[in-house]
């Protein structure tokens, strides 16, 4: 029942933490513009990976997309690598551990398919998580270089007047996102696999002792609990005890979504 | 069509206050910040704050800090604006005006003459 | 705050000529998040509520006369008519709304001769 608990929550945290990463990476505010000394702004600027933003205090919105592959900085091709494929592979996740839930029955598959699949999805949950801690991370990385380099240059101009401003970008609601959802993933990974290990138990393997008894000739071999380390496919003298009545509780999550040139 | 009618012009004595009008149609009233702007005879023009009556909120210009308060009415679509402790220096034409995309005042009141004198 | 420099304070032309007044601010009105600059230019007829004619300084409000032709970036920004008319009379005044307090610049009267 434990196992079946710690894969269930597992799956539940990792389908909101890739739910999460989907709505991070979609998200048009991965940076938004420092209003250090001036909270109220005539005009806001926004940027995300795909499209950057400018609000007016008018409520007027545009947005504009990178229409260009080759003109953008490595970086933010990087942290779009980085995001996709921690998506492609929680998803991959996603459907490889609906199949390797205990509660849910296909056909005859056998508990150590089960704790292979399991393990497998743990795997790629963990590594999901941290492909998108690790783009936002450098995301954020890029922005804090980028904020004091602009900082630096900030006041220019002839005999000290001011004639330009530079915008000054700080961390988006996205980054926070993509970091919470990058760790909820990780976590609800760890928890697959550790559930793996309860769904697979060690196994011990009893040689088959022969007793000769006068007159008879009866061979006794004890039907002791053989249970496979979760890679073998042995399934003879197998024996499993749940500790009592299934429950199988169908938790479901719905992801809440929220909003370089 | 958009239109923005403001009340009629007032007199008054220094250091009494006033509160001016400005009813909205053809819009969505709650939706649009409304602007207030002073014109002294003769002179140029001078923002005097905003309000969003939506929610409430309000940027001011430092300068009419204290002597200006914007208020709106959803119900009734009318923007307010309260002139306090009035001097010949706030003898003036008073207009309101919506605020549309590009951050520009679209439409504008006739204006509200307000005379300060005793 | 942004301070709005406009020159000359006035100027006299005769119908069908062509005329160009200017604007500076004390910063930038460039946003570089949509290189839009936020300048905006208004007419005011005598006894009237000023109109709207220009925004984002070059974007022409809709039922706007072609002749009026807003131009310039970052600092300095000009309007111009190509061929006044007699119903150009009027006082022109631009507008920071880039940032907070909104200003106006000081004006140009255009007479007609």
């Known amino acids: 029942m434990a196992v079946t608990a710690c894969q269930g929550l597992g799956f539940v945290v990792s389908l909101i933490g890739i739910a999460g990463i989907i709505a991070a990476t979609c998200m048009d505010q991965w940076s938004t513009q420092d209003l250090y000394n001036n909270p109220v702004t005539a005009v806001f600027n926004y940027q995300g990976l795909w499209r950057s933003c400018v609000r007016e205090s008018s409520g007027f919105t545009e947005c504009r997309g990178y229409f260009t592959l080759l003109g953008l900085p490595a970086m933010l091709q990087a942290v779009r690598a980085l995001m996709i494929v921690g998506i492609v592979l929680g998803a991959i996740g996603l459907l490889v551990s609906i199949f390797a839930l205990k509660c849910i029955r296909i056909g005859s598959m056998e508990d150590s398919a089960k704790a292979n699949m399991t393990l497998t999805s743990g795997i790629m949950f963990i590594v999901s998580g941290l492909c998108a801690i690790a783009g936002v991370s450098v995301f954020a990385n890029m922005l804090v270089t980028n904020f004091w380099m602009s900082t630096a240059n900030m006041y220019t101009g002839m005999g000290g007047m001011v004639q330009t401003v530079q915008t000054r970008y700080t961390f988006g609601a996205a980054l926070f996102v993509g970091w919470v959802a990058g760790g909820l993933t990780l976590i609800g990974g760890v928890m697959m696999c550790i559930a793996c290990r309860g769904l697979a138990p060690e196994e011990t393997n009893y040689k088959a002792v022969s007793y000769h008894a006068s007159g008879h000739s009866v061979a006794y071999k004890p039907g002791g609990f053989k249970a496979s380390t979760g890679f073998g496919s042995n399934t003879k003298n197998k024996k499993i005890y749940d500790g009592g009545a299934r429950t199988e509780d169908e938790v479901q999550s719905y992801p809440s979504k929220h909003d370089y040139v | 069509q958009v239109q923005l009618q403001q009340s009629g012009a007032e007199l008054v004595k220094p250091g009494a206050s006033v509160k001016i009008s400005c009813k909205a149609s053809?819009?969505?009233?709650?939706?649009?910040?409304m602007n207030w702007v002073k014109q002294r005879p003769g002179k140029g023009l001078e923002w005097i704050g905003q309000?969003?009556?939506?929610?409430?909120?309000?940027n001011y210009n430092g300068g009419f800090k204290g002597k200006a308060t914007l208020t709106a009415d959803k119900s009734s679509s009318t923007a307010y604006m309260h002139l306090n402790s009035l001097t010949s220096e706030d003898s003036a034409v008073y207009f309101c005006?919506?605020?549309?995309?590009?951050?520009?005042?679209?439409?504008w009141g006739q204006g509200t003459s307000v005379t300060v004198s005793s | 705050d942004i301070v709005m420099t406009q020159s000359p304070s006035s100027l006299t032309v005769t119908a069908g000529e062509k005329v160009t007044m200017s604007c500076k601010s004390s910063?930038?009105?460039?946003?570089?998040?949509?290189?839009?600059?936020?300048l905006t230019w208004y007419q005011q007829k005598p006894g009237q509520p000023p109109k709207l004619l220009i925004y984002?300084?070059?974007t022409r409000e809709s039922g706007v006369p072609d002749r009026f032709t807003g131009s310039g970036s970052g600092t300095d920004f000009t309007l111009t008519i190509s061929s006044v008319q007699a119903e150009d009379l009027a006082v022109y005044y631009c507008?920071?709304?880039?940032?907070?307090?909104?200003?106006f610049g000081s004006g140009t009267k255009l007479e007609i001769k």
């Open positions: 005006a919506r605020w549309g995309t590009g951050n520009t005042m679209d439409y």
């Open positions: 053809g819009y969505a009233f709650s939706n649009y910040w």
């Open positions: 309000i969003y009556p939506g929610n409430g909120n309000t």
């Open positions: 910063q930038s009105l460039l946003n570089s998040g949509n290189q839009k600059n936020y």
């Open positions: 984002w300084a070059s």
């Open positions: 507008q920071n709304v880039y940032s907070y307090p909104i200003t």
